[in-house]
C-alpha cells in the first residue's frame, strides 16, 4: 500500500476581507477509509471548520465533488472572510474507529493572514 500523505501546498495564504479564500488539500491515497476534516489551530481547543461526513458549514464549500469514489481533492473555499478568520488551517485524515474515528495524519497547515485592503 502507498503511504497516505496530506499535501497542503501553500504555507501562507494572504486573503482580503469580504472575499473568498481557497485552502488547498490533496491526499495521495484513499486508504485507510475514513473522513477528512478541516481545523483551525491545533490541540484540544482547535476549531472545526469543515467535516466531510456531517454538519452544517454555511460559509464553506468544497472545490471538488467529494461524492466521487476516487476523489483525492479535499480543498475548501471559505466565503466572506473577516479578520476573525486568520489562523493556521489543517486538513486532517481520520481512519475509521469505534466508537470514534481516530486521527491518522495531518497536513502541514496553511497560515491564513490578511493582505492589503483593496484600493
Amino acid at each position: 500500500e502507498e503511504e497516505l500523505q496530506m499535501i497542503q501546498p501553500e504555507k501562507l495564504l494572504l486573503v482580503t476581507v469580504g472575499k473568498t479564500a481557497t485552502l488547498h488539500c490533496t491526499v495521495t491515497s484513499l486508504l485507510p477509509v475514513g473522513p477528512v476534516l478541516w481545523f483551525r489551530g491545533v490541540g484540544p481547543g482547535r476549531e472545526l471548520i469543515y467535516n466531510q461526513k456531517e454538519g452544517h458549514f454555511p460559509r464553506v464549500t468544497t472545490v471538488s465533488d467529494l461524492t466521487k469514489r476516487n476523489n483525492m481533492d479535499f480543498s475548501i473555499r471559505i466565503s466572506s472572510i473577516t479578520p476573525a478568520d486568520v489562523g493556521t488551517y489543517y486538513c486532517v485524515k481520520f481512519r475509521k474507529g469505534s466508537p470514534e474515528n481516530v486521527e491518522f495524519k495531518s497536513g502541514p497547515g496553511t497560515e491564513m493572514a490578511l493582505g492589503a485592503k483593496p484600493s
Epitope: 485507510p32 477509509v33 461524492t67
Partner: antibody
Framework: DVQLVDSGGGVVRPGESLRLSCAAS????????MSWVRQAPGKGLEWLAG????????YYIDSVKGRFTISRDNSKNSLYLQMNSLTAEDTAVYYC???????????WGLGTLVTVSS | ALTQPASVSANPGETVKITCSGG??????YGWYQQKSPGSAPVTVI????KRPSDIPSRFSGSASGSAATLTITGVRVEDEAVYFC???????????FGAGTTLTVL
C-alpha cells in the same frame, strides 16, 4: 421526509431495452451520490451502479458494464438506469438508493419490477 | 464475498448477534439492511459500521473489527423478524457488495 419513488419497470422480451427512473424528494438531491441495487426473485441484494452527486463519475459492477448506464438530472431531482440487451437473468426488483458520505446506503426506493421473458 | 449465517433464531427479549465477514477493516465500511418481505424496500438499520439512523430503535447496534462486522439486536422483538443483509463498500475497488442475507426468526 426523504422519498425515493422508482418507476419504469415492466415486462420486456430478451434483447430489448428499458429505462428506469427514480424521483427524489425531501432532500437536496444534487448533494448526494446515488445507486441502483436489484434483487432477483428469491435472491439477495446486488449493487449495480453508482453515480456521483454532480453526475460526472459513474461506477458499475462488471456484469452490467457496457449494457447499463446510470445517469441523473439534478434539475429534475431524478435518477435513471438505462438497461440494454436485457436477458432473463436481469429479472428482478430494482431499487434506487441514496448514498451516505462513504458510499453505503441510508434511504431506499420502493422498487420497480422488471421481468424479462419471451 | 461477504459471508453471513443463513438463519438465526431467538426468543423475544433475547440478544441476537449476526456476523458478517470478508471485508478488510483498512478499506471497508459496513452497513446492515432489514427486509421484512421479499421485494419490499430494504430499511437501513446501520451504516458506517456503527451509525444508526435517527428513526431506528436503539436496540439495534453495529460494530466492526478486523475482517468482520456484527449487528446486535438487544431485546429482540417479534416485529424484528426479517432478513438482514450486510453490505460493504470497499475503498480499494470502489465497489459495493452484499452478503446473502440472514433470516431472523423470533420464536
Amino acid at each position: 421526509d426523504v422519498q425515493l419513488v422508482d418507476s419504469g419497470g415492466g415486462v420486456v422480451r430478451p434483447g430489448e431495452s428499458l429505462r428506469l427512473s427514480c424521483a427524489a424528494s425531501g432532500f437536496t438531491f444534487s448533494s448526494y451520490a446515488m445507486s441502483w441495487v436489484r434483487q432477483a426473485p428469491g435472491k439477495g441484494l446486488e449493487w449495480l451502479a453508482g453515480i456521483s452527486a454532480g453526475g460526472s463519475d459513474t461506477y458499475y459492477i462488471d456484469s452490467v458494464k457496457g449494457r447499463f448506464t446510470i445517469s441523473r438530472d439534478n434539475s429534475k431531482n431524478s435518477l435513471y438506469l438505462q438497461m440494454n440487451s436485457l436477458t432473463a437473468e436481469d429479472t428482478a426488483v430494482y431499487y434506487c438508493a441514496r448514498e451516505t458520505w462513504n458510499h453505503l446506503f441510508d434511504y431506499w426506493g420502493l422498487g420497480t419490477l422488471v421481468t424479462v421473458s419471451s | 464475498a461477504l459471508t453471513q449465517p443463513a438463519s438465526v433464531s431467538a426468543n423475544p427479549g433475547e440478544t441476537v448477534k449476526i456476523t458478517c465477514s470478508g471485508g478488510d477493516y483498512y478499506s471497508t465500511y459496513y452497513g446492515w439492511y432489514q427486509q421484512k418481505s421479499p421485494g419490499s424496500a430494504p430499511v437501513t438499520v446501520i451504516h458506517s459500521d456503527d451509525k444508526r439512523p435517527s428513526d431506528i430503535p436503539s436496540r439495534f447496534s453495529g460494530s466492526a473489527s478486523g475482517s468482520a462486522a456484527t449487528l446486535t439486536i438487544t431485546g429482540v422483538r417479534v416485529e424484528d423478524e426479517a432478513v438482514y443483509f450486510c453490505g460493504a463498500y470497499d475503498g480499494r475497488t470502489y465497489i459495493n457488495t452484499f452478503g446473502a442475507g440472514t433470516t431472523l426468526t423470533v420464536l
